[in-house]
Interface confidence: low
Amino acid sequence: FKVATPYSLYVCPEGQNVTLTCRLLGPVDKGHDVTFYKTWYRSSRGEVQTCSERRPIRNLTFQDLHLHHGGHQAANTSHDLAQRHGLESASDHHGNFSITMRNLTLLDSGLYCCLVVEIRHHHSEHRVHGAMELQVQTGKDAPSNCVVYPSSSQDSENITAA
């Protein structure tokens, strides 16, 4: 399977909400012995390998934000910890998964990574990730709503192994 990032740049005004999205592509094994671990974290630019450094999002680690379920099942983080930080990660039946960040501040600007780990019980793990940039703007030139920039075709199927 692969992870696609439909948008590689999100430009948002301060105070707005944004939903960053990744999409699970390709054949997904729906067997009983396969589960998917999906999560989000921040990283930094200029690394040799993008997304190799895992930093928290608003003090929440990738473990705090994870979704754990089988195949294309729906799931979301409903626990108070994430919501208290204005965060919610979710997944639908079509392989889309997202993190919603509420009331953006300039400190939220940066590189965000989604991570999918396919876990075959008693066997191996397969990891893929996608990266996208969030730019939060303030002042008179800030947009009234978030503006998203599509990934190029080669970027949208970001299949780098983590």
Partner: antibody, heavy 117, light 106 residues
């Protein structure tokens, strides 16, 4: 003040490549997308693609994919647009423009590329 | 791809006249941007987010519209307004321009 200064006019033969530069100054180079737009003689504006200098991500209009390459050099705050396999219909003025969220707020002076045998 | 169609292609007008240029989108979009291009010059930002005047643009210019139909209006045209006007959308990829409307001053 914000400035985008483009390289000079070029005359190329069909089949050749051209590389146009766009040097930015007066703002933080890595914070803004740079778009490329071209205008054939007596014709309208046509968006070609753009590059986000912070990450190097590029977005090309399908029509130009495979022929256009946009790159950036953060050390000199310069963006480059290279167009290959030139044909006569590529004769145009090529503009770079800074993108402020949803608008192109500053434009380069344009670079005339003439393709002629 | 969203096609933007401007009307008219060309208009010859007298100073102080009111001018209306329309831009019709093939699909609904969030907003439109207008650019002005004078002969042998680079395009210049005129109106952003459908109706907001760019810095330094005279108040005789205004923009309106939503969905698929947008309008640029110049009240009391002045000689310096002779130019080609383009609408542009960045709501849906790929970004596209209208074919342009050339205004000539009689």
């Amino acid at each position: 003040q914000v400035q985008l200064v483009q390289s000079g006019a070029e005359v190329k033969k069909p089949g050749a490549s051209v590389k146009v530069s766009c040097k930015a100054s007066g703002y933080t180079f890595t914070d803004y997308v740079i778009s490329w737009v071209r205008q054939a003689p007596g014709q309208g504006l046509e968006w070609m693609g753009e590059i986000y200098p912070g990450s190097g991500n590029t977005y090309y209009y399908e029509k130009f994919k495979g022929r256009v390459t946009m790159t950036r050099d953060t050390s000199t705050s310069t963006v480059y647009m290279e167009l290959s396999s030139l044909r006569s219909e590529d004769t145009a003025v090529y503009y770079c423009a800074r993108v402020l969220v949803s608008v192109m707020d500053y434009w380069g002076q344009g670079t005339l590329v003439t393709v002629s045998s | 791809e969203i096609v933007l169609t401007q009307s008219p292609d060309f208009q010859s007008v007298t100073p102080k006249e009111k001018v209306t240029i329309t831009c019709s989108a093939s699909s609904s979009i969030n907003y439109i941007t207008w650019y002005q291009q004078k002969p042998d010059q680079s395009p210049k930002l005129l109106i952003k987010d459908t109706s907001k005047l760019a810095s330094g643009v005279p108040s005789r210019f205004s923009g309106s519209g939503s969905g698929t139909d947008f309008t640029l209006t110049i009240n009391s045209l002045e000689a310096e307004d002779a130019a080609t006007y383009y609408c542009h959308q960045r709501s849906s990829y790929p970004w596209t321009f209208g074919q342009g409307t050339r205004l000539e001053i009689k």
